[in-house]
């Protein structure tokens, strides 16, 4: 009788796989910011280490009365999950408890910088195997935290956060919000969002999958062998430490941006009902619960995606939003979306030597947002290609010219506000393969790119009728790089990538006045690695 | 994910009054200061004072220092709480906050956040 | 060898108390927690509480609250459970065990018969 | 609290037979469940720790299985010495220590 937290992360042919690194050692250590912790639990008791490390403020009021359960309760609960004998993902896992939330579960910025520098710094002194540091705590959003992050992942260190149990826009939250974080919301036996009280699990652009985090079995810090059942975040981020946990043990040099993608990748898709997120979070919202994926052998050289959301441009007439891949990832593609419809498009530009895709809002416009697709392709060597507007009632045509280049993704960029413009239908003369094809006054970005055994093509779906999206999607084998609304439809609100689905929308006034002939095109852009073969377009 | 979320930052580059001292009054602030939206999740009192990337660990030990002295010349008392030298150059403070705008014109001043609670989810 | 050896059963009037000793040797006293536990007649186990001899911590099961204290004295190596306003109902063979590292009972006195009677 | 169930009550076997005893607990609890053997006049005796370790000196035709809610005590062929009362146990928060109700293992 397997805890059902367990079984819907853990798929049957890995249950009773040992994970194991090529040396016959698991050499992962997981670093656990939380309270203090039971170490003598039988469900942890030799596998975890409780450093010296304490920072953490005074408890309030003056009538608390520190009860060592009760303080440990927590952090024993999470150690537990994470590598219990029992009950835990990575059972057979190393910890180190640093304690720095106090025994009412309150911690601060400070406390938790001085703890990931603590980390930091053992580090340095004894060099070890991959690390993992889980952060099952949230505060409101700091620039500091973030960067401390940041700058302990690109050391190569894994960090997992709970994304927030404030039933809110993980954003507004740290370390949830620090893009080098995994950043992980709660789902329950029936994958749907948990619910805590009044509030419940975060949600956004920041998260970047759900886990199991209701009524999780785990270790309970009443007695030695007790168990109990916690909720929240917190659990969810546990699970996903322990299935990164299991991920380096069994191949140790996965990088941070592999670890993601592949989580990503493997997770269940479109489980969660998506209706108990803010209508406005929807979209931004992954629809991920983790499970843990097969190791690459088994894989082989899948070219791996995912859809990065940049914040919301706001309102103003020229406000740009900003959308980035995280530094070993490819952005193959930048579109972008806005609910008024009202945009200027999206164009991809280099940015301290990075480049970074671009959404422009209109005048009148509510705001956009860029959507960047961050792809992991090896030995790739990508570039763009623009070119201007051309005159009113023509389109503009860019293609891949370089040799052995395949085109990734398409951007439009207009000059003109008047959105008019844009709704007269374009002369489209027969698509050649490989190019991006403008709409009418729109500067056209390709996004070009040679790797070893890269091919892609195109796949277009319209529909002439009322229809508020129109979808298309690769087919298995194939990944989706690229997304757009091609021209001749009415007005957009965009277009971005779900998974390996690509979505054109609508604007709802936009259905009653479009002529017959008229049809929203939605274009996707598969491609597929194949290490042995050339790169190629395929027709 | 990188963009500022809803956060207080507020430039605090007043030209203080009482700085007769040329290597104080040179200096103009350019760093901000920053806060928690929430204000029941604050700490005011406790600030951690972010330098530039590339300050060197003389120079993070060396502002703190000035910091200290600069409080002292108008009878404050800063207790320095701790030096960040591995994650990033910077200081935890405890001071009061009448001396924020003292310390956003430090040399190598990038911003100061005001610390604040986190808590287990 | 490890050895627990009880004492100090009989009959006792109703509302009376007694006193009961667990004599341990065989092994470092203070390293295990000492548990008791009774069983009446014909009738299945029942934890009354335990004491850790290293620090003299108790825990008791809520029902014996107030009704049983355990107590040690190391220099002796030997437990004692206190049991007060003694009922019919808490006629039982009384038995110290050790709960090792694991938690299990590895070692058990023979136990002590208490017959609560007028 | 949790509650362990043990089935049957009663089990009447003769000499050589199988038996086989469950117990199941009301809530999870890993595999930290003991097994005890007690026989008339006598104090228990641990007989298997964490649902399937052998305590010291107990023969090998008893093994223990099991873990999360569901657990089995099985007697591979029994002996004449084997006909006691059987209780299973484990350590929780309140009460800190629960045995089952007890198996009886009869002769037939």
């Known amino acids: 009788s397997i805890p059902w937290n367990l079984e819907r992360i853990i798929p049957a042919w890995h249950q009773t796989e040992e994970d194991r690194s090529p040396d016959g050692s698991s050499q992962v250590e997981v670093y656990l910011l939380d309270t203090s912790i039971q170490g003598a639990h039988r469900e942890i008791e030799g596998r975890v280490t409780i450093t010296d490390f304490n920072s953490v403020p005074e408890e309030d009021g003056t009538r608390f009365h520190r009860q060592a359960s009760k303080c440990d309760s927590h952090g024993t609960h999470l150690a537990g999950v994470v590598s219990g004998r029992d009950a835990g993902v990575a059972k057979g896992t190393s910890l180190h408890s640093l304690r720095v939330l106090n025994c009412q579960g309150k911690g601060t910025v400070s406390g938790t910088l001085i703890g990931l520098e603590f980390i930091r710094k053992s580090q340095l002194i004894q060099p070890s195997g991959p690390l993992v540091v889980l952060l099952p705590l949230a505060g409101g959003y700091s620039r500091i935290l973030n960067a401390a992050c940041r700058h302990l992942a690109r050391t190569g260190v894994v960090l997992v956060a709970a994304a927030g149990n404030f039933r809110d826009d993980a954003c507004l939250y740290s370390p949830a919000s620090a893009p080098e974080v995994i950043t992980v919301g709660a789902t329950n036996a029936q994958d749907q969002p948990v619910t805590l009280g009044t509030l419940g699990t975060n949600f956004g652009r920041c998260v970047d999958l759900f886990a199991p985090g209701k009524d999780i079995i785990g270790a309970s810090s009443d007695c030695s062998t007790c168990f109990m059942s916690q909720s929240g975040t917190s659990q969810a981020a546990a699970h996903v430490a322990g299935i990164v946990a299991r991920m380096l043990s069994r191949e140790p040099t996965l990088t941070l941006a592999e670890l993601r993608q592949r989580l990503i990748h493997f997770s269940t898709k479109d489980v969660i009902n998506m209706a108990w997120f803010p209508e406005d979070q929807q979209v931004l919202t992954p629809n991920l619960v983790a499970t843990l994926p097969p190791s690459t052998h088994e894989t082989g050289g899948q070219l791996l995606c995912r859809t990065v959301w940049s914040a919301h441009s706001g309102p103003t007439r020229t406000a740009t939003a900003t959308a980035r891949c995280a530094p070993e990832e490819e952005l193959l593609s930048c579109s972008s979306f806005s609910r008024s419809g009202r945009r200027r498009g999206d164009w991809i530009e280099a940015i301290g030597g990075q480049q970074v895709c671009k959404a422009l809002n209109a005048f009148g416009g509510e705001g956009v947002y860029a959507v960047a697709r961050c792809c992991l392709v090896p030995r790739a060597n990508c570039s763009i290609h623009n070119t201007p507007a051309a005159r009113a009632g023509l389109e503009t045509h860019v293609h891949c010219h370089q040799k052995d280049h395949v085109l990734t993704g398409c951007s439009f960029h207009w000059e003109v506000e008047d959105l008019s413009v844009r709704r007269q239908p374009a002369l489209r003369s027969r698509r050649q393969p490989g190019q991006c094809v403008g709409h009418q006054a729109a500067s056209v970005y390709a996004s070009c790119c040679h790797a070893p055994g890269l091919e892609c093509k195109i796949k277009e779906h319209g529909i002439s009728g009322p229809s508020e999206q129109v979808t298309v999607a690769c087919e298995a084998g194939w990944t989706l790089t690229g997304c757009n609304v091609l021209p001749g439809a009415s007005l957009t609100l965009g277009a971005y990538s779900v998974d390996n689905l690509c979505v054109a929308r609508v604007h709802d006034t936009a259905r009653a006045d479009r002529t017959s002939g008229e049809a929203t095109v939605a274009a996707a852009i598969c491609c597929r690695s194949r290490p042995s073969a050339k790169a190629s377009w395929v027709q | 994910q990188d963009e500022d979320g809803d956060y207080e930052e507020l430039m605090l580059a007043l030209p203080s009054q009482e700085d007769g001292l040329a290597d104080e009054a040179a200096h103009v602030a350019t760093a901000t200061f920053r806060r928690c939206s929430k204000e029941a999740w604050r700490l005011p009192g406790t600030y951690i004072v972010v330098l530039m990337e590339e300050t060197q660990r003389l120079q993070i030990e060396q502002t703190a220092h000035r910091l200290q002295t600069r409080a002292a010349r108008r009878g404050y008392v800063i207790k320095v709480l701790h030096i960040f030298y591995d994650l990033f150059p910077g200081f935890l403070v405890k001071m009061s906050s009448d001396l924020l705008g003292l310390a956003l014109k430090l040399p190598h001043v990038e911003y100061i956040e005001e610390d604040s609670f986190v808590f287990a989810q | 060898e490890v050895q627990l050896l009880e004492s100090g059963g009989g009959l006792v009037q109703p509302g009376g108390s007694l006193r009961l000793s667990c004599k341990a040797s065989?092994?470092?006293?203070?390293?295990?927690?000492i548990n008791w536990v009774r069983q009446a007649p014909g009738k299945g186990l029942e934890w009354i509480g335990r004491?850790?001899?290293?620090?003299?911590?108790?825990r008791y099961n809520e029902k014996f609250k107030g009704k049983a204290t355990i107590s040690r004295d190391n220099s002796k190596n030997t437990l004692y459970l206190q049991m007060n306003s003694l009922r019919a109902e808490d006629t039982a063979v009384y038995y110290c065990a050790r709960a090792n590292d694991g938690y299990s009972f590895d070692y058990w006195g023979q136990g002590t018969l208490v017959t609560v009677s007028s | 609290e949790i509650v362990l169930t043990q089935s049957p009550a009663t089990l009447s076997l003769s000499p050589g037979e199988r038996a086989t005893i469950t117990c199941r607990a009301s809530?999870?609890?890993?595999?930290?469940l003991n097994w005890y053997q007690q026989k008339p006049g006598q104090a228990p005796r641990l007989l298997i720790y964490?649902?399937?370790n052998r305590a010291t000196g107990i023969p090998a035709r008893f093994s223990g299985s099991g873990s999360g809610t569901d657990f089995t005590l099985t007697i591979s062929s029994l002996e004449p010495e084997d006909f006691a009362v059987y209780y299973c146990q484990v350590w929780d928060s309140s009460p800190p220590v629960v045995f089952g109700g007890g198996t009886k293992v009869e002769i037939k």
């Open positions: 809530q999870y609890v890993g595999s930290y």
């Open positions: 964490d649902a399937s």
């Open positions: 004491i850790d001899p290293g620090n003299g911590g108790t």
């Open positions: 065989g092994y470092t006293f203070s390293r295990y927690g």
